[in-house]
């Protein structure tokens, strides 16, 4: 089959890193500088992605694979393939259209990216606040008030064993 295919289409013999050059009687020519072909039988080489501006090169382009970019310090990647770089903020902040803004009271962000999230409402689980929340940290919930009544044991029961093969979410 391969032999038949190559008789019909001489370009099918051109390996990755080359292209089938119509200007040279369909011989296999190496990809020009800063271009690549990741598969055989290509009639053109794709131009390499250039990591410019806030992008920086994570992986150099080769004759058979495209360059890969990440972001310069102070920025982080967004989207598949690091299609955009977004400004980092400090912990306790979120990025708005007007720049980095502190988290509103009752919310926190423990990362340099993403949005401020509400503190956990301990009372929904029948628990009390053990450690107050800050802009950078969520509240820490403690035992329920009933558990702290006089005579109640302070020893917590052992946690149930996890099913094998499941990682904690």
């Amino acid at each position: 089959f391969e032999r038949t295919r190559s008789l019909q289409d001489p370009c099918s013999n051109c390996p990755a890193g080359t292209f089938c050059d119509n200007n040279r009687n369909q011989i296999c020519s190496p990809c020009p500088p800063n271009s690549f072909s990741s598969a055989g039988g290509q009639r053109t080489c794709d131009i390499c992605r250039q990591c410019k501006g806030v992008f920086r090169t994570r992986k150099e382009c080769s004759s058979t694979s495209n360059a890969e970019c990440d972001c310069t310090p102070g920025f982080h990647c967004l989207g598949a393939g690091c299609s955009m770089c977004e400004q980092d903020c400090k912990q306790g902040q979120e990025l708005t259209k007007k720049g980095c803004k502190d988290c509103c009271f009752g919310t926190f962000n423990d990362q340099k990216r993403g949005i401020c999230r509400p503190w956990t409402n301990c009372s929904l689980d029948g628990k009390s606040v053990l450690v107050n929340g800050t802009k950078e940290r969520d509240v820490v919930c403690g035992p329920s008030p009933a558990d702290l009544s006089p005579g109640a044991s302070s020893v917590t029961p052992p946690a149930p064993a996890r099913e094998p093969g499941h990682s904690p979410q």
């Epitope: 500088p33 800063n34 053109t44 794709d46 131009i47 390499c48 992605r49 250039q50 410019k52 501006g53 090169t57 495209n66 967004l78 989207g79 598949a80 393939g81 299609s83 955009m84």
Partner: antibody
């Protein structure tokens, strides 16, 4: 090899929204940026904006408030919407594969003429 | 935005003779590792533009070797060593360093 084909109405009334779709064949829409570029009759080329297959967009500031580009990876298509059009938006509209996010347009559609007139 | 200026705007050439088009940018297009973010396109009559040169001097695959690009920083040149009848059309330079990418006003090459 990669081919791009623009489609959409050739006539749009002033103040309405121009809508075009670019269908990519002979290759996946993934892993590249995809741009719209226009050319008024007898004039030069103007880049309008790009979209990455993941949905990230960047627009020409001169058009930013009016232009929206979206992508449908399941159909291997991306689309342009330009709102509040005037006669100055009459142009041939090209879609193109953008190798670096605003650079080296290696593959172009054949272009479609959109006339803005009542 | 970066402004691109081409000269001449019209270029009559005899077949077999060389041709040269100049392009100047309002700021340097030289970026890391000596890469100039400048492309050259040819738009033949009634057709879409086609990429000829990228990175200032790299010929796109399949482009005849009579086309060459040179220059760095803000001054660039496209040369055709021997013009053929099929080379007629409008040549555009484009900067690809900053968003928005911007094109020169175009140089119309015609056969004498």
């Amino acid at each position: 090899q990669v081919q791009l084909q623009e489609s959409g109405p050739g006539l749009v009334k002033p103040s309405e929204t121009l809508s075009l779709t670019c269908t990519v064949s002979g290759g996946s829409i993934s892993s590249y940026y995809w741009s719209w570029i226009r050319q008024p009759p007898g004039k030069g080329l103007e880049w309008m904006g790009y979209i990455y297959y993941s949905g990230s967009t960047q627009y020409n500031p001169s058009l930013k408030s009016r232009v929206t580009i979206s992508v449908d990876t399941s159909k291997n298509q991306f689309s342009l919407k330009l709102s509040s059009v005037t006669a100055a938006d009459t142009a041939v509209y090209y879609c193109a594969r953008d190798q670096s996010g605003g650079g080296s347009f290696q593959h172009w559609g054949q272009g479609t003429l959109v006339t803005v007139s009542s | 935005e970066i402004v691109m200026t081409q000269s001449p705007l019209s270029l009559p050439v005899t077949p077999g003779e060389p041709a040269s088009i100049s392009c100047r940018s309002s700021q340097s297009l030289l970026y890391s590792q000596g890469y100039n973010h400048l492309d050259w396109y040819l738009q033949k009559p009634g057709q879409s533009p086609q990429l000829l040169i990228y990175g200032g001097s790299n010929r796109a695959s399949g482009v005849p070797d009579r086309f060459s690009g040179s220059g760095s920083g803000t001054d660039f040149t496209l040369k055709i060593s021997r013009v053929e009848a099929e080379d007629v059309g409008v040549y555009y330079c484009m900067q690809a360093l900053q968003t928005p990418p911007t094109f020169g006003q175009g140089t119309k090459l015609e056969i004498k």
